[in-house]
């Protein structure tokens, strides 16, 4: 008789999840000499320990503390790039501007990027069939709690000028319910962070509106100002040219507004 299994609304654990986490960990520690000391078997054991045998709607930040400890990493606190709903461009940017870092450029972010995982209460099995959906099932699921935990820590570490890349093509350019809006904004430390600079990325070719005047950006400015952090905003009208100019800042066409 097959064991009854909880059916969740979200996709199941990414296939070859353990192998993927281990392979990514080894690759990351090979590429980043400052993380060579990390033992990837221990990282996997800590990762697994955070959700295996636990009810996938009952995960806490505490469950991830052993993993956080093992993955402790110092990134230059004044070189942090946050993003919301525009991950690919943010990652393309840090691939070119190597001294800046998104969360996914850190070990823990790199390990989990684009992966899904969950377990089952009281069994050591990984659930490859389905995992809880944040909206339809529960918010305290293994994936959501992981990203909340690492995002909070990443924001807490930031200092000086923090940059955030926002998607100007969306109806809510700043969304209070995004990880950036619900976690990172509220965990920037006013005693360390002087300014939050938003880069609003335009999608349309002929879109010359000043999206820094968007009501949701004004809302972000209000939240940030109330936290005693200065706010500035820039329109990035041509993201393709923006990346090109990051690659070749001497290019004559890069002196004009991007």
């Amino acid at each position: 008789v097959p064991r009854w299994r909880q059916q969740w609304s979200g996709p199941g654990t990414t296939k070859r999840f353990p192998e993927t986490v281990l392979a990514r960990c080894v690759k990351y520690t090979e590429i980043h000499p400052e993380m060579r000391h990390v033992d990837c078997q221990s990282v996997w054991d800590a990762f697994k320990g955070a959700f295996i045998s636990k009810h996938p709607c009952n995960i806490t930040e505490e469950d991830y503390q052993p993993l956080m400890k093992l993955g402790t990493q110092t990134v230059p606190c004044n070189k942090i790039l946050l993003w919301s709903r525009i991950k690919d461009l943010a990652h393309q940017f840090t691939q070119v501007q190597r001294d800046m870092f998104t969360l996914e450029d850190t070990l823990l972010g790199y390990l989990a990027d684009d992966l899904t995982w969950c377990g089952e209460f009281n069994t050591s099995k990984i659930n490859y069939q389905s995992c809880p959906d944040w909206r339809k099932d529960c918010s305290n699921n293994p994936v959501s709690v992981f990203w909340k935990t690492v995002s909070r820590r990443f924001a807490e570490a930031a200092c000086d000028v923090v940059h955030v890349m926002l998607n100007g093509s969306r109806s809510k350019i700043f969304d209070k319910n995004s990880t950036f809006g619900s976690v990172e904004v509220h965990n920037l430390q006013p005693e360390k962070v002087q300014t939050l600079e938003a880069w609003v990325i335009h999608g349309g070719r002929e879109d010359s509106r000043d999206l820094c005047q968007d009501p949701t950006i004004k809302e972000l400015e209000s939240i940030i100002s109330k936290r005693n952090i200065q706010f500035s905003c820039k329109n990035i009208y041509r993201p393709d040219k923006f990346l090109q100019c990051v690659k070749n800042p001497e290019d004559s066409s890069c002196t004009s507004e991007i």
Epitope: P18, D39, Q41, S42, D45, K48, L70
Partner: antibody, heavy 118, light 109 residues
């Protein structure tokens, strides 16, 4: 300097017990998985057991499962191997190894000799 | 019980090239087995040479290289030196447990 020093080896009768220790220094012991490996006289290496950084995960070779127990005390930077129901075929040099996943065992102790004989 | 098989012995001339292989009884060796290679000389503990299939340690001479070859892990020594005479062991990872190969005695004649 990373160092591993094994102790506790000796001559023991079949069926008896012995506990090996491995004192670690020069690295953050509590962040690493650790292993025991043995080598019988004139024979090859045999992986015995591995323990995760916090002691929560342990894996054993089939030849020692149920008889040997690997453990660690992170406050003392020490790895242990409790060996029960010893047999003549357990006679070997036992090495403690600092294991980094994917990197193989990149630091080894000098080994401690266990002889099981009546 | 998983068995990892190596050539028991190989002989090579100084300056020559030799390839040692490592096969798994469970099927093809892949990068998921994270093959590692060790060198051991009489009276000494083993010394790691290659990890993660093909990456050499900082102390490993460049004449040593690792690869996957026809479903096996392989260690190639190019321009063999007299001091390379030793026993060589591969180690494979099986989801927590590890298994050493039986070892290859390399003679440099």
């Amino acid at each position: 300097e990373v160092q591993l020093v094994e102790s506790g080896g000796g001559l023991v009768q079949p069926g008896r017990s012995l506990r090996l220790s491995c004192a670690a220094s020069g690295f953050t012991f509590s962040s690493y998985a650790m292993s025991w490996v043995r080598q019988a006289p004139g024979k090859g290496l045999e992986w015995v057991a591995v323990i995760s950084y916090d002691g929560s995960n342990k894996y054993y070779a089939d030849s020692v499962k149920g008889r040997f127990t690997i453990s660690r005390d992170n406050s003392k930077n020490t790895l242990y191997l409790q060996m029960n129901s010893l047999r003549a075929e357990d006679t070997a040099v036992y090495y403690c190894a600092h294991l980094r996943f994917g990197y193989g065992m990149d630091v080894w102790g000098q080994g401690t000799t266990v002889t099981v004989s009546s | 019980q998983t068995v990892v098989t190596q050539e028991p012995s190989l002989t090579v001339s100084p300056g020559g090239t030799v390839t040692l292989t490592c096969a798994s009884s469970t099927g093809a060796v892949t990068s998921d087995h994270y093959p590692c290679w060790f060198q051991q000389k009489p009276g000494h503990p083993p010394r790691a040479l290659v990890y993660s299939t093909d990456t050499i340690h900082s102390w490993t001479p460049a004449r040593f290289s690792g690869s996957l070859l026809g479903g096996k892990a392989a260690l190639t020594v190019s321009g063999v030196q007299p001091e390379d005479e030793a026993d060589y062991y591969c180690l494979l990872y099986y989801g927590g447990a590890r298994v050493f190969g039986g070892g290859t005695q390399l003679t440099v004649l």
